[in-house]
């Protein structure tokens, strides 16, 4: 009985586990266990695409690179048709590439939680990480993710990381900037006039603050007098009356921070 069939194939990869390091060599042998009639052509495919000029029973890959990772198979044809081997998944291992940091999320609001993720292409996956804040190593942080449950202004700055696997240590990438936003800090209302203030004087007050992110864009004063609302942090009260007892200012960015009220102590003329 002469049963015609497409070639029956097996693929043998060297090394046997199909795991190699970048720069190593790999060989695949296409074994024809049976073919009726005799086979005529041999070809090799990677990820389903035919590899050019590869028409022998062996596929030799010299000094492999990571982009040669993938699924390989051989195809052998006879007059009945093509037979195809099972796929071999070639894994090319390499040391971590320069890492990048992803921040969830920046800008961050003071008091919120922030997560940093160190991303680095590597095979096998990195087993250890080193984190840096403004170039200084963050002690005790060796995981892929860093979680800060309550962000403070001093947490702002550049975060970078280095990934490490069994093949080596990657390079520190450019890092990512954490912007911490918060209301204006230490807002004070300051009376610029010499004391005492007399009824009918012109009083100048300034609204001062220590720091702010984003920048202060406006100021508010209370109580709301008949005076013109100034855009700068200076308030002039013309012809002050004895009933103008206390004044408070607020410096505002996305939030307003109010200073404690100050007493004018206006004296009768």
């Amino acid at each position: 009985l002469n049963v015609k069939h497409t070639p029956k194939l097996e693929i043998k990869v060297t090394p046997s586990d199909a795991i190699v390091r970048e720069g190593d060599s790999v060989t695949m042998t296409c074994e024809v266990s049976s073919s009726n009639p005799e086979y005529t052509t041999v070809s090799w495919l990677k990820d389903g695409t035919s590899l050019k000029k590869q028409n022998t029973f062996t596929l030799n890959l010299r000094e492999v690179t990571k982009d040669q990772s993938g699924k390989y198979c051989c195809q052998v044809s006879n007059d009945v048709g093509p037979g195809r081997s099972e796929e071999v998944f070639l894994q090319v291992q390499y040391a971590p590439e320069p890492s990048t940091v992803q921040i969830l999320h920046s800008p961050a609001v003071e008091g919120s939680q922030v997560e940093f993720l160190c991303m680095s292409l590597a095979n096998p996956l990195p087993t250890n990480y080193t984190w840096y804040h403004n170039g200084k190593e963050m002690q005790g942080r060796t995981e892929e993710k860093v979680h800060i449950p309550k962000i403070l202004p001093w947490h702002a700055g550049t975060y970078s990381c280095v990934a490490e696997n069994i093949l080596g240590t990657g390079q520190r990438g450019p890092g990512a900037e954490l912007d911490v936003q918060y209301p204006p800090k230490k807002v004070t209302t300051v009376i610029q006039n010499p004391m005492p203030i007399r009824e009918g004087d012109t009083v100048t007050l300034s609204c001062n603050y220590n720091s702010s992110n984003p920048s202060v864009t406006r100021y508010e004063w209370k109580p709301h007098g008949a005076w013109e609302e100034p855009s700068l942090g200076v308030l002039k009260i013309q012809n002050v009356g004895w009933d103008n007892t206390t004044i408070a200012c607020a410096a505002c960015n996305s939030w307003c921070s109010w200073a404690s009220p100050v007493a004018l102590n206006v004296q009768y003329a």
């Epitope: 043998k12 046997s16 060599s25 060989t27 042998t29 074994e31 022998t56 030799n60 071999v88």
Partner: antibody, heavy 118, light 113 residues
Framework: QVQVQQPGAELVRPGTSVKLSCKAS????????MYWVKQRPGQGLEWIGV????????YYNQKFKGKATLTVDTSSSTAYMQLSSLTSEDSAVYYC???????????WGQGTTLTVSS | DVVMTQTPLSLPVSLGDQASISCRSS???????????LHWYLQKPGQSPKLLIY???NRFSGVPDRFSGSGSGTDFTLKISRVEAEDLGVYFC??????????FGGGTKLEIK
């Protein structure tokens, strides 16, 4: 039919080099690997290296790196192994053999007896 | 490297007897593709080695059916059901699963008792 032919013997001086040949016939030379194996008198078999004639891809036994160099001439279907800096330790029978890729070695040459002597 | 150990070193037999040669590897010879690349060669006196069995149990072309191979993992056996005079010589096992390097057993000499 498949044939792998080797010269019977070579006599060389210590410190010199020798190039052993292995002529194949009866099949498509570039489709099969060519292995080289060393056998000292009364000893076992020791793999030296292998070459794929289709693209000159080679694997060497670490022990023979720097000692053996494998090449092929596809136009004459001949494989070569050059052995350098010869000493008496290199005196042995050297076989070339046709292999089915990295799977198994099917056909062996008759072997070349190399004698290194002054 | 995979170390191949053959026993016995020498095997005296009478013609017509059954002979059995053992080969043990230092690690499993099962390849990731499921095949086991363990082979047997016979080197007759004054000749080059000849392939008898490939991949544990497949007889090479022209090899008589009195030769059979078996085993799995790390333990393998070559059996000759009825030894003939032309079977005398040194038998080698070899592995090509974990390569390079391709490695051979030390050999078993089959001789007349």
């Amino acid at each position: 039919q498949v044939q792998v032919q080797q010269p019977g013997a070579e006599l060389v001086r210590p410190g010199t080099s020798v190039k052993l040949s292995c002529k194949a016939s009866g099949y498509t030379f570039t489709r099969y690997w060519m292995y080289w194996v060393k056998q000292r008198p009364g000893q076992g078999l020791e793999w030296i290296g292998v070459i794929d004639p289709s693209d000159n891809f080679t694997y060497y036994n670490q022990k023979f790196k720097g000692k053996a160099t494998l090449t092929v001439d596809t136009s004459s279907s001949t494989a070569y192994m050059q052995l350098s800096s010869l000493t008496s330790e290199d005196s042995a029978v050297y076989y070339c053999a046709r292999g089915y890729g990295s799977s198994y070695v099917g056909y062996w040459g008759q072997g070349t007896t190399l004698t290194v002597s002054s | 490297d995979v170390v191949m150990t053959q026993t016995p070193l020498s095997l005296p037999v009478s013609l017509g007897d059954q002979a059995s040669i053992s080969c043990r590897s230092s690690q499993s010879l099962v390849h990731s593709n499921g095949n086991t690349y363990l082979h047997w060669y016979l080197q007759k006196p004054g000749q080059s080695p000849k392939l008898l069995i490939y991949k544990v149990s497949n007889r090479f072309s022209g090899v008589p059916d009195r030769f059979s191979g078996s085993g799995s993992g790390t333990d393998f056996t070559l059996k000759i059901s009825r030894v003939e005079a032309e079977d005398l010589g040194v038998y080698f096992c070899s592995q090509s699963t974990h390569v390079p390097p391709w490695t051979f057993g030390g050999g078993t000499k089959l001789e007349i008792k």
